[in-house]
Every structure is written in structure tokens, then in C-alpha cells.
Interface confidence: low
């Protein structure tokens, strides 16, 4: 007899069992079910991608063979039934017709049937062998796939482990960074507070220093004068003693010329031995009228009388004729010394004029005129300049020949416009000319394309407003 069974073994694999008479054939086939599903941490396609490309074909071919095997099995079962039925009939007939002695014929039929069965069994054995070969091949392939999959799984597990390690490390570092940021913020805040405190302290100290500097200058001047007076007194005493002890002494006492205690300019102060830059009191020539001026005792050998300074826009330079005549501002900062004093001073002896310039990019330049003087007020303080040298001196930025001085209320320029009103500040405007160091002060980033700014054309062009300027004078024979 023969039958065919399909079942599942204890490992969950499908098994195919064919029983043919006393022989029983069992086929254990690996299943694709054993692959992990996509819900697994590792996607199934990631593994299958490395499997041989003919795997699906093999499975299909196996299914075809299964179908053939089933068909053959069913055909054998039908044949078996047919034989059994026929045998029953034949046996009855034999029993009924035993007398007729047809045994030989029956044996022949039986033999024929047996031969057919044997042939069929051989065919089935061939099919089984084919199935076994195919199964073995598939098993080998699947074994290779399994090994490959195991390797991949191991690699993935290693990588995952590595990723987890890195993630942990990253989290640790992130926490560290956050902690550092927190500390940094605290430190910054602390530093800001310290900075603010220091700024307050610095500003306090600055004002104290300013006061001390002023006191020092005054003390220095007083000290120098006292020393001179003491020296004079000693000389006078000695002179008197000599006269008293001399038998041929005359009754009249030679009175020494009074020591100079007034100064016309910073050069005289410098030559008197006072060589510290600062604010000093100057006296108008041939007069007792005084004026405060800043003396630069360091730059270019010292002895410079500052007649103009711009540095921060703290002083308004759009002033009247009278203000420009007598001067305005603060000698320690932005100021104009005064046209009347400068005119009187520069007409007493020959002076040089140095103009020092600073731009917003940190560059510095200067123009030096070897001879400078201002006419009197009757001639509108007209400027006279000759002998130009310096780093900003290809062409004079103060128009030649010299122009009259103009202010917002006294228009003496060569333009039908009013240059001082339009360009701001008092200056020796031409029409309106290539310079104006008394123009509107513009801060950085707002200092370009300004026609009314602090201009020195032959250094920075027409629309550039300078950061700082200083005009200073000194005797030519210093």
C-alpha cells in the first residue's frame, strides 16, 4: 500500500512522508518562515539581500515537484484501489469458476499488474531521488544563507553595540557641554559685573587723575616760579652783601630785571623748563590779557601751541564770528583757541603750522606749512600759508592764495552760497574749497558721503569726515 502525509516536526519545520508498502520516505525541508519578520530589530530584507538570487526559483521548482509527487501518489492510490477491487472480483470469479480452471489467466493478470506496479514504483523512486537531490542542494544553499545571515546578524549586533556605546558617550559629552555652558554663563555674568565695577572705578580714577594732573601742572608752574624767585632773592641778597662789604660801593642798588613769569606761547613755556603737556595760561603779546591753551610738549620736539582740536564731537563748532574770535570749547578736549590771539601771535614773529589728521581706519597723516599767519580782524583773519610738506601734502587742502575766515553770521567766502551755513563751522572757505576741519562731527559708519563733515580733501576725498584733527603752531626758529 502507499500513502502521502504532510506534517510539522518539533522544530517547526515541514516534513513530507511518503509510505509505499513496507518502505517509508521522509523529507525534511527548511522553510523561509524561519527568517525574522520585519518587525524584528533587523529588517529581513537586509539579510535576504545577501542570499543567492536563484533562491525563489528553487522554492518554486520544489513546489512543482511536490505537485508532481502528489499527483503520482494519488494515481498510485487509485491504482491500488483498482487492483484491490479487481482482485476481489477475480477471487469471486475464481471461487465461482474454480471448476473451469482459469487460474493461469488470473496469475497472468496478477503478474501484469505487479509488473505495472513495479514500474510505477521505479518511476516514483526516480522522482524521489530527484526530490532528494534538489532538497539536498537547497539545504546546502540554505545552510550557506544561514551562515551568511548569522555573520550579518553578528556584525549588526556589534554595530548596534558600538552605536549604543557612542550614544552613551555622546550623552555624557552633551551633559558635560551643558554643565560647562552653565559654568561659562555664570563666569561671563561675573566678569560683566566685575567689568562694570572696574569701569566705574576707572571713570572715578580718571576724574581723580584729571584733577591731580591739573593740580600737578599748577604745582609745577608754582614750584618753578618759586625756585626762580628764591634764586633771584639769593642773588639779590648776595649782591647786597657784596655791596655792603665793599668800601667803594655806590649808594644806588642795581635792581635786576624781573624774571619772566608770563608766556606768549608754549615754546616759551617749554624753554623755561616746563616740559609736561597740559593746559597753560598764555598772555596776549603787548598786553596783560590772558588765554588758556593746551601745550603739546612731546610731539615733534614739543613746544606746540594747540589752536584747534577735534576728537569726539562733544563741542558744537557751528559758532558765531565773535566766538571764533575769542575762542571756545575745552582746552583739554575739543576747542578753538581764538582767531584774535592767533592773529596777534603770528604777526609778532614767524610761525609754522602743523595739521595732524586721523581717519576711522587707524591711519594718521599731517600737513606742515613752513610759514603761517592770520591777518587782522579788519581783513577777516585771512590765512597766509607757504612751504607745504608732510604726508597729506601733495596739494594744499587750504585754498591758495589764502581765503578770508567765514562763520554762519559772517559770510566772506568766494561762493554765491554761504559756505559756513551749508557746510557747518567757521573756516577759511573758498567756494567752498577742499577743506573744513570745523565741520559737523560724524561718528564711524556715518562718516562717508558727508559734504558738511570734517574734511581734508587731499588726503581722504570730498565726502569723508575725519575722526580727529589737531592744528598746532610753533615759532619757526624753535
Amino acid at each position: 500500500y502507499s500513502n502521502f502525509r504532510k506534517s510539522v516536526d518539533s522544530t517547526g519545520r515541514r516534513q513530507y512522508q511518503v509510505q509505499n508498502g513496507p518502505c517509508s520516505y521522509t523529507f525534511l525541508l527548511p522553510e523561509t518562515d524561519s527568517c525574522r519578520s520585519s518587525s524584528s530589530p533587523y529588517m529581513s530584507n537586509a539579510v535576504q539581500r545577501d542570499a543567492p538570487l536563484d533562491y525563489d526559483d528553487s522554492v518554486q521548482r520544489l513546489q512543482v515537484l511536490e505537485n508532481i509527487l502528489e499527483n503520482n501518489t494519488q494515481w498510485l492510490m487509485k491504482l491500488e484501489n483498482y487492483i484491490q477491487d479487481n482482485m476481489k472480483k477475480e477471487m469471486v470469479e475464481i471461487q465461482q469458476n474454480v471448476v473451469q480452471n482459469q487460474t493461469a489467466v488470473m496469475i497472468e493478470i496478477g503478474t501484469s499488474l505487479l509488473n505495472q506496479t513495479a514500474a510505477q514504483t521505479r518511476k516514483l523512486t526516480d522522482v524521489e531521488a530527484q526530490v532528494l537531490n534538489q532538497t539536498t542542494r537547497l539545504e546546502l544553499q540554505l545552510l550557506q544563507h544561514s551562515i551568511s545571515t548569522n555573520k550579518l546578524e553578528k556584525q549588526i549586533l556589534d554595530q548596534t553595540s558600538e552605536i549604543n556605546k557612542l550614544q552613551n558617550k555622546n550623552s555624557f559629552l552633551e551633559q558635560k557641554v551643558l554643565d560647562m555652558e552653565g559654568k561659562h554663563s555664570e563666569q561671563l555674568q561675573s566678569m560683566k559685573e566685575q567689568k562694570d565695577e572696574l569701569q566705574v572705578l576707572v571713570s572715578k580714577q580718571s576724574s581723580v587723575i584729571d584733577e591731580l594732573e591739573k593740580k600737578l601742572v599748577t604745582a609745577t608752574v608754582n614750584n618753578s616760579l618759586l625756585q626762580k624767585q628764591q634764586h633771584d632773592l639769593m642773588e639779590t641778597v648776595n649782591s647786597l652783601l657784596t655791596m655792603m662789604s665793599s668800601p667803594n660801593s655806590k649808594s644806588s642798588v642795581a635792581i635786576r630785571k624781573e624774571e619772566q613769569t608770563t608766556f606768549r606761547d608754549c615754546a616759551e613755556i617749554f624753554k623755561s623748563g616746563l616740559t609736561t603737556s597740559g593746559i597753560y595760561t598764555l598772555t596776549f603779546p603787548n598786553s596783560t590779557e590772558e588765554i588758556k591753551a593746551y601745550c603739546d610738549m612731546e610731539a615733534g620736539g614739543g613746544g606746540w601751541t594747540i589752536i584747534q582740536r577735534r576728537e569726539d564731537g562733544s563741542v558744537d563748532f557751528q559758532r558765531t564770528w565773535k566766538e571764533y574770535k575769542v575762542g571756545f570749547g575745552n582746552p583739554s578736549g575739543e576747542y578753538w583757541l581764538g582767531n584774535e590771539f592767533v592773529s596777534q601771535l603770528t604777526n609778532q614773529q614767524r610761525y609754522v603750522l602743523k595739521i595732524h589728521l586721523k581717519d576711522w581706519e587707524g591711519n594718521e597723516a599731517y600737513s606742515l606749512y613752513e610759514h603761517f599767519y592770520l591777518s587782522s580782524e579788519e581783513l577777516n583773519y585771512r590765512i597766509h600759508l607757504t612751504g607745504l610738506t608732510g604726508t597729506a601734502a601733495k596739494i594744499s587742502s587750504i585754498s591758495q592764495p589764502g581765503s578770508d575766515f567765514s562763520t554762519k553770521d559772517s559770510d566772506n567766502d568766494k561762493c554765491i552760497c554761504k559756505c559756513s551755513q551749508m557746510l557747518s563751522g567757521g573756516w577759511w572757505f573758498d567756494a567752498c574749497g577742499p577743506s573744513n576741519l570745523n565741520g559737523q562731527y560724524y561718528p564711524q559708519k556715518q562718516n562717508t558721503n558727508k559734504f558738511n563733515g570734517i574734511k581734508w580733501y587731499y588726503w581722504k576725498g570730498s565726502g569723508y569726515s575725519l575722526k580727529a584733527t589737531t592744528m598746532m603752531i610753533r615759532p619757526a626758529d624753535f
Epitope: S399, C415, I416, C417, C419, Q421, M422, L423, D430, A431, C432, G433, P434, F451, K455, Y457, S462, G463
Partner: antibody, heavy 120, light 106 residues
Framework: EVQMVESGGGLVQPGGSLRLSCAAS????????MSWVRQAPGKGLEWVAN????????YHVDSVKGRFTISRDNAENSLFLQMSSLRAEDTAVYYC?????????????WGQGTLVTVSS | EIVMTQSPATLSVSPGERAILSCRAS??????LAWYQQKPGQAPRLLIY???TRATGIPARFSGSGSGTEFTLTISSLQSEDFAVYYC????????FGQGTKVEIK
């Protein structure tokens, strides 16, 4: 005395070219921005172009950009306007004018003008 | 561009009378406005700049006022030599003129 005299105007066909000149005297040309301003017959004034003291910056009104070019020769105290691809609408009296100060666009001195006629 | 509009186009005034000319800017130009006078066959002449400052040599009868977008030129007592065309011009952003106001004898 400040004086400016234009020359070079005349009749020209559409698409043609002309070069206007302005001779300046009585002031130092190199110290001023200079401009060309035009006036169509019976119409208003229109600023055409200007040029910085040293010639390093030039500006033109949109309607003439690419066709007109302003230039100067400070050594010769002269201002120029090269005009090409002329159109009928360029017909006008062309004045050269001195900018009062640093491109403020205030014209304190003007020439008497030169007439440019573009017609076929 | 900034458009300058003048009104009226023509103003008829008798000698000795006051003339008021208006100029409007399409956007604020602060006080960056000038007035020019032009007589037939002549070049323009600068009268006022900065909206209200008279140029050198300009008689006191000419005065300017306004800021932002509305400006006025006033001729307090018209003289025979004042009959001409008057142009306003802005120099706040590039340079543009109004179309002009003709002041004629009434």
C-alpha cells in the same frame, strides 16, 4: 570771474553721436564736482550726469545710461559729454554746471548752454 | 525717483504784489530743496538752497520755507526783473527738478 562755455552742439541724425565740451575758467576745476543738465525746448530742467573732482566717480540718469559718458580733463580745465545712439527725445539745450560743494547737487554756476537737435 | 510737482503752472501777478509759488515732493526730502530762476534765453540762477537760505547776492524779497514734502517760494513785492520761470529742485536723493512755474505780468 567764474565762467563756463559749452560747445559741440548741433544737428545730428537719430543713432548718431556728438561730443560736448565745457571750458571752465575763473576757478580750479579739480576742486569741484561738475554736472550736465539739459532742457528740452519749452520744457523743464533735467539732470543728466555728474563727475567727482578727480573723475573717479561718475553718475548718469537712467534714460542715458549706456549711451552718454561724462568725463573731465582737470589739466585743461574741461568737462565733456560723449553722446551716442542719439534719439529724438535727447533734443535739448545742454548746460554744464558747477556743483556748489561735494556733490550736494546744488548748481551755483551755469554755462549759457549748447543746443543739440536730433532729427532726420 | 523723487518727483517734484510745482503749482500753479502759470501765475499772473501785478508788479509790487506778492507771489507765492508751491512745490511738492513725492516723498520727504527734509530741507534739501533749492529754487532757481530762469529768464528766456538764459541759464538758471540759484536763489534759495536748504529750503530757506538765500544764496549770496539774492535780494531779501525772495524767501523760502517748508520741509518734508511741502515747500513755498515767496516773492514779497514783485519787481519787473522778477518775471521769469521758477524751478524747484531736490537734492536729497539724486537730483530732480519740478516742471516750473511761470510768473507773468498781470
Amino acid at each position: 570771474e567764474v565762467q563756463m562755455v559749452e560747445s559741440g552742439g548741433g544737428l545730428v541724425q537719430p543713432g548718431g553721436s556728438l561730443r560736448l565740451s565745457c571750458a571752465a575758467s575763473g576757478f580750479t576745476l579739480r576742486s569741484y564736482w561738475m554736472s550736465w543738465v539739459r532742457q528740452a525746448p519749452g520744457k523743464g530742467l533735467e539732470w543728466v550726469a555728474n563727475i567727482k573732482e578727480d573723475g573717479s566717480e561718475k553718475y548718469h540718469v537712467d534714460s542715458v545710461k549706456g549711451r552718454f559718458t561724462i568725463s573731465r580733463d582737470n589739466a585743461e580745465n574741461s568737462l565733456f559729454l560723449q553722446m551716442s545712439s542719439l534719439r529724438a527725445e535727447d533734443t535739448a539745450v545742454y548746460y554744464c554746471a558747477r556743483d556748489m560743494e561735494a556733490s550736494a547737487g546744488l548748481f551755483d554756476y551755469w554755462g549759457q548752454g549748447t543746443l543739440v537737435t536730433v532729427s532726420s | 525717483e523723487i518727483v517734484m510737482t510745482q503749482s500753479p503752472a502759470t501765475l499772473s501777478v501785478s508788479p509790487g504784489e506778492r507771489a507765492i509759488l508751491s512745490c511738492r515732493a513725492s516723498q520727504s526730502i527734509s530741507s534739501n530743496l533749492a529754487w532757481y530762476q530762469q529768464k528766456p534765453g538764459q541759464a538758471p540762477r540759484l536763489l534759495i538752497y536748504g529750503a530757506s537760505t538765500r544764496a549770496t547776492g539774492i535780494p531779501a524779497r525772495f524767501s523760502g520755507s517748508g520741509s518734508g514734502t511741502e515747500f513755498t517760494l515767496t516773492i514779497s513785492s514783485l519787481q519787473s526783473e522778477d518775471f521769469a520761470v521758477y524751478y524747484c529742485q531736490q537734492y536729497n536723493y539724486w537730483w530732480t527738478f519740478g516742471q516750473g512755474t511761470k510768473v507773468e505780468i498781470k
